[in-house]
Each structure stands twice: as structure tokens, then as C-alpha cells.
């Protein structure tokens, strides 16, 4: 049997119902409607999509974002929702489909010709003109790899981890998301026990680097559950 094992930075997702795949009702999927593994008869058809549970946008597909399915719904229940097309309402960039970004609550095209000025204006609007930096982090930097070709450096505004340079991930910082360093061995990490707990973090940590996982520090085993310290440790 095959088991999904999410890394320490993600919630432990329940797999979709047997014989089906996860996704969205009514979503048009351009790829062939099935999964085919060469060398065998493991073919199954995907017709009815089921919502996929998530804690953050990075756990969803590139044409999705992570949110509560109902307006003002339970923050602990989040699923991957189909991205919003141009001229649809939005609250953040990740809600808009690739090639678009969120400006003044509406998804607009990230057309290269007039994009740079608009995005800088949007970032300034979001954070106010008074403070151009937050804890020394510059605000007017790469927003998305779909928009700029250079990868975001540490402190750059981002949508997802693929927007950031190697060794960095995209994590929440106040009400924005910026590129932060992936955690090294021995650094404190966050182990999420509850679904949706990502949404409560104002200062989100990156996940542990390659070959590391977030585990309880050995000398903290005796401590109470709430005070247990997790660190990045070798597998």
C-alpha cells in the first residue's frame, strides 16, 4: 500500500476517497483524465474531484489557493480552492490564477509592460507609505517568479516558496509573506498539531532543510505537551 507522508511543515492530510482523486467539482482539467503508470495496468479515471485539505497555499496545486470553503467559515477547516480568474474578487495574490495578481481586491493581469509600477504601488498600499521596511526587510522586491525572472532573496515579498532563491522558503511575516531561510540542523521548528494552526502564525517559520525533520528535542521529552521544543534533526 502507498501512504502519503507530509513533511513536518504541513498538516497530515487525509487521502481522498478510494478510487477518486482530489480536486474540484466542475474544474476543467486539460491533462488526460487518468493516471497511467507505465509497465502495468494501474490506470484509474478521475471524474469527480474531491476537495483537498490544506494548511497553506503551497500544499495546493498551482491553479489553486488554500482557504476556508465558506465565507467566515471555521478557520480550522481549509481546502484547496480553484484560483480566481481575471476581474474576480481577491484578498491576496495567491487567490489569483497564474499570470494575474491581486490589486485593490480584484485579480488583474500581470502584464509585463505596465506591471512593475502597479505591483510596487500595490505593495505600498498594503503596508502604508510611512514604513518602507519591516524589521529591516525591504518591501519592494520580487513578488512572484511568474512576474519576475529573478528569484527572491531573503526578505523579498513572495507568494510561494518557488518565488524564493535556493535555501529560502516563502513564509508569513506579519500580514505579508516573505522569503526566509530554510531551517538548519538544531534550529527550532514548528510542528503543527492542529489543522489550520498555520493560519494563526504571524511569524511563520520555514520548514527544515533537506535530510532534516522537525522532531521533539531529546532533552525535552519530559516537558509538558505545550512546552515541548521541536528542532530540525537528521532523519
Amino acid at each position: 500500500t502507498l501512504n502519503s507522508v507530509l513533511n513536518s511543515n504541513a498538516i497530515k492530510n487525509l487521502p481522498p476517497p478510494l478510487g477518486g482523486a482530489a480536486g474540484h467539482p466542475g474544474s476543467a482539467v486539460s491533462a488526460a483524465p487518468g493516471i497511467l503508470y507505465p509497465g502495468g495496468n494501474k490506470y484509474q479515471t478521475i471524474d469527480n474531484y474531491q476537495p483537498y485539505p490544506c494548511a497553506e497555499d503551497e500544499e495546493c496545486g498551482t491553479d489553486e489557493y488554500c482557504a476556508s470553503p465558506t465565507r467566515g467559515g471555521d478557520a480550522g477547516v481549509q481546502i484547496c480552492l480553484a484560483c480566481r480568474k481575471r476581474r474576480k474578487r481577491c484578498m491576496r495574490h495567491a487567490m489569483c490564477c497564474p499570470g494575474n495578481y491581486c490589486k485593490n481586491g480584484i485579480c488583474v493581469s500581470s502584464d509585463q509592460n505596465h506591471f512593475r509600477g502597479e505591483i510596487e504601488e500595490t505593495i505600498t498600499e498594503s503596508f502604508g507609505n510611512d514604513h518602507s521596511t519591516l524589521d529591516g526587510y525591504s518591501r519592494r522586491t520580487t513578488l512572484s517568479s511568474k512576474m519576475y525572472h529573478t528569484k527572491g532573496q531573503e526578505g523579498s515579498v513572495c507568494l510561494r516558496s518557488s518565488d524564493c532563491a535556493s535555501g529560502l522558503c516563502c513564509a508569513r511575516h506579519f500580514w505579508s509573506k516573505i522569503c526566509k531561510p530554510v531551517l538548519k540542523e538544531g534550529q527550532v521548528c514548528t510542528k503543527h498539531r492542529r489543522k489550520g494552526s498555520h493560519g494563526l502564525e504571524i511569524f511563520q517559520r520555514c520548514y527544515c532543510g533537506e535530510g532534516l525533520s522537525c522532531r521533539i528535542q531529546k532533552d525535552h521529552h519530559q516537558a509538558s505537551n505545550s512546552s515541548r521544543l521541536h528542532t530540525c534533526q537528521r532523519h
Epitope: 507522508v5 481522498p16 480536486g23 482539467v29 491533462a31 478521475i46 489553486e64 518557488s162
Partner: nanobody, 125 residues
Framework: EVQLVESGGGLVQAGGSLRLSCTAS????????VGWFRQAPGKERDFVTA????????AYADSVKGRFTISRDNAKNTAYLQMNSLKPEDTAVYFC??????????????????WGQGTQVTVSS
Amino acid sequence: EVQLVESGGGLVQAGGSLRLSCTASGSAFSSHVVGWFRQAPGKERDFVTAINWSGARTAYADSVKGRFTISRDNAKNTAYLQMNSLKPEDTAVYFCAAGRDRYARDLTEYEYLWWGQGTQVTVSS
């Protein structure tokens, strides 16, 4: 179109380690799911592990859980398979594969559209 090239295979003793790389060229690698599969002589090609476009989700076959680790570096257009505590039964040709990651689903259920040529891993006892 995505072209995939595997490297890092070879002969290793039981208990040893190997690190396979899967380097992509062509279409935007950072928006694809990447999977590793293996095929032993006379057997079916089996799922080993997979990672979603961002690296936030991974999945492993039970037989490799705790020994193998998948990761990716989108800036380098490369995915990695770190294989530790290798056993003779891990001997196989290892293939990497990629597919569009537009809609999230269980990582064992993706349609892998592009495949590499494979790299031989032999574990001797």
C-alpha cells in the same frame, strides 16, 4: 514539454547511501509534481516517492519510508532522492517523472506525463 535526466546511480553495499538527481529542462519545472519510480528486472514499475510543486507535500511507499527522502530545488530545476540504509531489494532502475500540479490530489495519484531514461542502482549484500 519537460526533459528529465537522472544521475547518481551506481553500485553500493547494503547499508550504504546514494543520492539520485533528476534535472529538468524545458517547461517550468517549479509548477510540476515530481515522482521517483523503480523497476526491478522482470517486475512492474513501482511508485517510490513524490513531491509537489512547492516541496510542501511529500509521499512515500511503505517500503522506503524512513530510509528515503525526496526534496527539490526549483532554482536549480532539480529534484533529489536521498537513499539511506540501502537493501539488496532496493536494486532496480530508478526513474524520475514529472506531471502538471494544477490541482492538488493524493501524490500517489498524479498523471506523470514526462519520464527520464532511468539510472541503475545496485545494492550488493
